[in-house]
Interface confidence: low
């Protein structure tokens, strides 16, 4: 039986149940390399409190569909008096990166995970030539996730002092030059995640091989190497390599660009100070507010919620978008889809799509950007569920009683982008990170 998601096969992935202090190791194609879980465990549960291990999914007892992977075991469990077996269930959804398995919940018998990943898409529109896991858990089981930094097209220009060369990088995956026509990146070879441009020539100086690593609580490292043997003539016989160190800043700050800190014989060392290197709970909330000791800021967007069935309306040329954020009020047009953002075709108002649902909400404040994301909308042909990304700007003189109004700015691959100037996006900082 062929592996169902080959892009995910090369790695053992991790997920965490934070409430119960449980670390799961998952290998969807083979077995995890943990002796205590036995030789054929595909999902190994590590109970950190008791320092015990249990296999909750056997690689031999795998069943797969396009969107669901189940690993059974031979271990009995008692659920409502019936004799079940312990199993793990992973639901796959189309995503724009390899993504991360997320622990959802566990019963006595079943451990549930959800995974938004390119591997589950119906088309290969988001697939990379080469991509590696882009998240890590620190020793306190806090998740550091660089997936939001991954560029699906184009690349980041590294800040260095050499006027003759430009070093471009992507995070955790190769640079997609196909989607970035007309730029100097067009010359970059397929597969490169670090591309050195000199004049009209471009050189592969590194491809992703291993996933993200944590070296200290607030320092993450990503290494790229040039895979094929051929040496570059300007490298003095050395093989090129790139090391990117992502640093979580000691206090809240605006984003910075990656900086070249050392260069010798085509070995490039880059440091990138970014809040995306901090643990995810520092950056994100599932509610419409971010506050408390952990986040160093006070943000509350809940006053933007509309009551009484009214919605914000944003004009998108062919479509009208109805938005109702930070609440669970149904949008009238959206046919009980539980949509926070609803897309209606102007020429045919019966064509209605949920562009993100209110129970799939993430508020993120990172590198000075405040973003509200709604995902899990109606599927596009690629299998990707429509989502909306609302970028907020502080405006103390915003109209509509300070609330302002969302403005549609564009769509890329079934992700809808809005900007919203409002006084409620003005962030209050605390200083004790």
């Amino acid at each position: 039986q062929a592996a169902p998601f080959p892009e995910l096969c090369s790695y053992t992935w991790e997920a965490v149940d934070t409430k119960n202090n449980v670390l799961y190791k998952i290998n969807i194609c083979g077995s995890v390399d943990i002796v205590q879980c036995g030789p054929s465990s595909a999902v190994c549960m590590h109970l950190l409190k008791t320092r015990t291990y249990h296999s909750v999914g056997d690689s031999v007892l795998r069943s797969a569909t396009r969107s669901l992977l189940e690993f059974n075991t031979t271990v009995s469990c008692d659920q409502q008096g019936t004799n079940h077996r312990v199993q793990s269930s992973i639901a796959f959804l189309c995503g724009k990166t390899l993504g991360t398995p997320e622990f959802v919940t566990a019963t006595e018998c079943v451990h549930y995970f959800e995974w938004r990943t390119t591997a589950a898409c119906k088309k290969d529109i988001f697939k990379a030539n080469k991509e590696v896991p882009c998240y890590v858990f620190d020793e306190e089981l806090r998740k550091h996730d660089l997936n939001p930094l991954i560029k699906l097209s184009g690349a980041y220009l590294v800040d260095d002092s050499d006027p003759d060369t430009s070093l471009f990088i992507n995070v955790c995956r190769d640079i997609d030059t196909l989607r970035d026509p007309g730029s100097q990146l067009r010359a970059c070879p397929p597969g490169t995640a670090a591309c050195l441009v000199r004049g009209h020539q471009a050189f592969d100086v590194g491809q992703p091989r291993d996933g993200l690593k944590v070296v200290r609580k607030d320092r993450l490292v990503l290494s790229y190497v040039r895979e094929e043997a051929g040496k570059l003539d300007f490298c003095d016989g050395h093989s090129p390599a790139v090391t990117i160190t992502f640093v979580c800043p000691s206090e809240r700050r605006e984003g910075t660009i990656p900086k070249l800190t050392a260069k010798s014989n085509c070995r490039y060392e880059i440091e990138w100070i970014t809040e995306y290197a901090c643990h995810r709970d520092y950056l994100e909330s599932k509610t419409c507010s971010l506050s408390g000791e952990q986040q160093d800021v006070s943000i509350d967007l809940t006053p933007l919620a509309q009551s009484g069935g009214s919605s914000y309306i944003s004009d998108g040329k062919e479509y009208l978008f109805y938005l109702n954020v930070c609440g669970e009020t149904e949008i009238q047009f959206c046919n009980k889809k539980q949509a926070a953002v609803c897309q209606v075709k102007k020429s045919d108002t019966s064509q209605v799509k949920a562009a993100g649902r209110y129970h799939n909400q993430t508020l993120r404040y990172s590198d000075g950007d405040l973003t509200l994301i709604y995902f899990g909308g109606d599927e596009c042909s690629s299998g990707f569920q429509r989502m909306s990304v609302i970028n907020f700007e502080c405006n103390k003189t915003a109209g509509n009683d300070g609330k302002g109004t969302p403005v549609f700015t564009g769509e890329v691959d079934c992700t809808y982008f809005f900007t919203w100037d409002t006084e409620y996006a003005c962030v209050h900082h605390h200083h004790h990170h």
Epitope: P4, P6, R66, K122, D124, I125, K127
Partner: nanobody, 116 residues
Framework: QVQLQESGGGLVQPGGSLRLSCAAS????????MDWYRQAPGKQREWVAT???????TYADSVKGRFTISRDNTKNTVYLRMNSLKPEDTAVYYC??????????WGQGTQVTVSS
């Protein structure tokens, strides 16, 4: 049985043309990204062209403007039209399919020789 079968190779004079075909069976062809690669004697396999399932086409610098990749989903076939052939285009040409749910699939290859 999932497989790819190349055809259309042969001996051609410099400046001549060929059209290579790659027929796929056992896969949902339209969901796959299709690539052409080539391997000259004693050299590493090199990428030639890509046609993504959503329509993007891209080419190696060495063939840009001379080669064209296309597909016919009704025939489950991808083509590589090669014009203005040069001796350095001599190689075995392989097609590859990359799908969301299967391992990459390679064909057996077809020989192209450009010589006067």
């Amino acid at each position: 049985q999932v497989q790819l079968q190349e055809s259309g190779g042969g001996l051609v004079q410099p400046g001549g043309s060929l059209r290579l075909s790659c027929a796929a069976s056992g896969i949902i062809f339209s969901d796959n990204r299709m690539d052409w690669y080539r391997q000259a004697p004693g050299k590493q396999r090199e990428w030639v062209a890509t046609l993504a399932s959503y329509g993007w086409k891209t080419y190696a610098d060495s063939v840009k403007g001379r080669f064209t990749i296309s597909r016919d989903n009704t025939k489950n076939t991808v083509y590589l039209r090669m014009n203005s052939l040069k001796p350095e285009d001599t190689a075995v040409y392989y097609c590859k399919a990359s799908s969301p749910v299967l391992n990459d699939i390679w064909g057996q290859g077809t020989q192209v020789t450009v010589s006067s």
